[in-house]
């Protein structure tokens, strides 16, 4: 799957949306690697 910074950001946004924003405070694009998905 795509591991560019932009892909990671969009994937994380989708994850946050589906979870209702209930995630760890440090779960942000610049802190998570592609392995988080």
């Amino acid at each position: 799957s795509c591991n560019t910074a932009t892909c990671v950001t969009h994937r994380l946004a989708g994850l946050l949306s589906r979870s209702g924003g209930v995630v760890k405070d440090n779960f942000v694009p610049t802190n998570v690697g592609s392995e988080a998905f």
Partner: antibody, heavy 119, light 107 residues
Framework: EVQLVQSGAEVKKPGASVKVSCKAS????????MNWVRQAPGQRLEWIGD????????NYNQKFKGRATLTVDKSASTAYMELSSLRSEDTAVYYC????????????WGQGTTVTVSS | DIQMTQSPSSLSASVGDRVTITCKAS??????VAWFQQKPGKAPKSLIY???YRYSGVPSRFSGSGSGTDFTLTISSLQPEDFATYYC?????????FGGGTKVEIK
Amino acid sequence: EVQLVQSGAEVKKPGASVKVSCKASGYTFTDYYMNWVRQAPGQRLEWIGDINPNQGGTNYNQKFKGRATLTVDKSASTAYMELSSLRSEDTAVYYCASIIIVPNYFDYWGQGTTVTVSS
Amino acid sequence: DIQMTQSPSSLSASVGDRVTITCKASQNVDTNVAWFQQKPGKAPKSLIYSASYRYSGVPSRFSGSGSGTDFTLTISSLQPEDFATYYCQQYNNYPYTFGGGTKVEIK
């Protein structure tokens, strides 16, 4: 309100260097990657590279590798793009841009910085 | 590098027209494509990400579709403020690359 405010226009001579700044506000600067894109007169957009402001990691377009340097000052929430060994073909508008999730999911762009390279 | 080929390079249309712009990638980019609108002297404005998702605040007349190598931006009913240049971008692979642009002009 999320804002990316860039430094003013620059005129440089061939062979010189230029450093463009991009001051971020309205969001957590270190949470999101910063991209740099340029557009020469009448040309398509061209991606220069991106930087992770949290760790300082960078990705560069090979076309600019060795000439472009992306850095950040976390304490000032400011990103920088330095381009060295300037030539006339580097005359362009340079933009910073960042896709933000919080507070608003959007792709924000700076207003652009015109760099003119002329002898 | 992945080449993004946009067509047409320019088109003339009237207010109310349905406008379709296409973008072809030189290799598979999945759905990792964005569309931008740019007006003279202004920074690009993001419209679409992940091929078909509109950013908040983007009018519903703008829609995107496609996957793999073929992508489309459609403006269902052209408005006066839509006359601009439109660019596609792939972000599936580094370096990110843009199409050559489609200038939408008033007929």
